[in-house]
């Protein structure tokens, strides 16, 4: 059963390592894949002494852990590299960090990337 699913056809693209990888630095990435597979957007970033450094943004292959996520939110507590994925066109344009502990209330740190 799938309820109210949003298709992902394109995602915001960013690659901090664009020169080495020989890609564009930023843009819009069309998401390709098998017809029977879902597609997602992702963002990955680091927090260096309070400063957000985006590592990559783009399309993400069919992954059940990304299903039904309309917003790109990292919930893991203090990860080394932050990661989130979501469904819906350009849903990785904004990403945020809501560390969810089992007992404490989450705190919100929304981020609007400015590569």
């Amino acid at each position: 059963a799938i309820l109210g699913r949003s298709e992902t056809q394109e995602c915001l693209f960013f690659n901090a390592n664009w020169e080495k990888d020989r890609t564009n630095q930023t843009g819009v990435e069309p998401c390709y894949g098998d017809k029977d597979k879902r597609r997602h957007c992702f963002a990955t970033w680091k927090n260096i002494s309070g400063s957000i450094e985006i590592v990559k943004q783009g399309c993400w292959l069919d992954d059940i852990n990304c299903y039904d996520r309309t917003d790109c939110v990292e919930k893991k507590d203090s990860p080394e590299v932050y990661f989130c994925c979501c469904e819906g066109n350009m849903c990785n344009e904004k990403f945020s960090y809501f560390p969810e502990m089992e007992v404490t209330q989450p705190t919100s740190n929304p981020v609007t990337p400015k590569p």
């Epitope: 597979k37 069919d62 996520r69």
Partner: antibody, heavy 118, light 111 residues
Framework: EVQLLESGGGLVQPGGSLRLSCAAS????????MSWVRQAPGKGLEWVSA????????YYTDSVKGRFTVSRDNSRNTLYLQMNSLRAEDTAVYYC???????????WGQGTLVTVSS | QTVVTQEPSFSVSPGGTVTLTCGFN?????????PSWYQQTPGQAPRTLIY???TRSSGVPDRFSGSILGNKAALTITGAQADDESDYYC??????????FGGGTKLTVLG
């Protein structure tokens, strides 16, 4: 420490019903997709069902479609498997497993035995 | 119906190297199927070894490695030890929520 504790297994007659539960702790349950995997005596592992983080998407192996229902209660950190119209071939140890990015099973419970026999 | 195939059994000498493979009936295995590998000893829950083709799970010794060999996923164990004697399962993620297990390989460490 991540813990997954299954319960609800037991002996049931063919055609009967059982509800399995999996109590999760040590991680943010509402942020993880979950799965049920089973293993018949002396046989290999078989994926049974999966459910997305919100419970909005559910998936089943063909042999249990229409008979089994997976659900989750994120406020109780608990995963469920409602099994109806049970058959002898459903006899197995049922494991619940946490699913992480790249759609793999990163943590497993110890399993609960379901025996379908008259 | 997708069928994932593994060698039913395999033997290796202590200290030797063994490569177990995982294929399927409807084409080539690629990284987009997120191949993962699990070890199971009798009476125990499975243990995660490798995910996303070649990433070792935490605490897994570097004797275990994953790859794509030709059109199959592969698990290689180098310097095999007696306690590597177990059943090994691969899983392919077919997309749209569906996972498929291979039939498993029973690995015997000789001696």
């Amino acid at each position: 420490e991540v813990q997954l504790l299954e319960s609800g297994g037991g002996l049931v007659q063919p055609g009967g019903s059982l509800r399995l539960s999996c109590a999760a702790s040590g991680f943010t349950f509402r942020n993880s997709a979950m799965s049920w995997v089973r293993q018949a005596p002396g046989k290999g592992l078989e994926w049974v069902s999966a459910i997305s983080v919100t419970g909005g998407s559910t998936y089943y192996t063909d042999s249990v479609k229409g008979r089994f229902t997976v659900s989750r209660d994120n406020s109780r950190n608990t995963l469920y498997l409602q099994m109806n119209s049970l058959r002898a071939e459903d006899t197995a140890v049922y494991y619940c497993a946490k699913v992480y990015y790249y759609s793999f099973f990163d943590y497993w419970g110890q399993g609960t035995l379901v025996t379908v026999s008259s | 119906q997708t069928v994932v195939t593994q060698e039913p059994s395999f033997s290796v000498s202590p200290g030797g190297t063994v490569t177990l493979t995982c294929g399927f009936n409807s084409g080539s295995v690629s990284t987009s199927y997120y191949p993962s590998w699990y070890q199971q000893t009798p009476g125990q829950a499975p243990r995660t070894l490798i995910y996303n083709t070649n990433t070792r799970s935490s605490g897994v010794p570097d004797r275990f490695s994953g790859s794509i060999l030709g059109n199959k996923a592969a698990l290689t164990i180098t310097g095999a030890q007696a306690d590597d004697e177990s059943d090994y399962y691969c899983v392919l993620y077919m997309g749209s929520g569906i996972h498929v297990f291979g039939g498993g390989t029973k690995l015997t460490v000789l001696g």
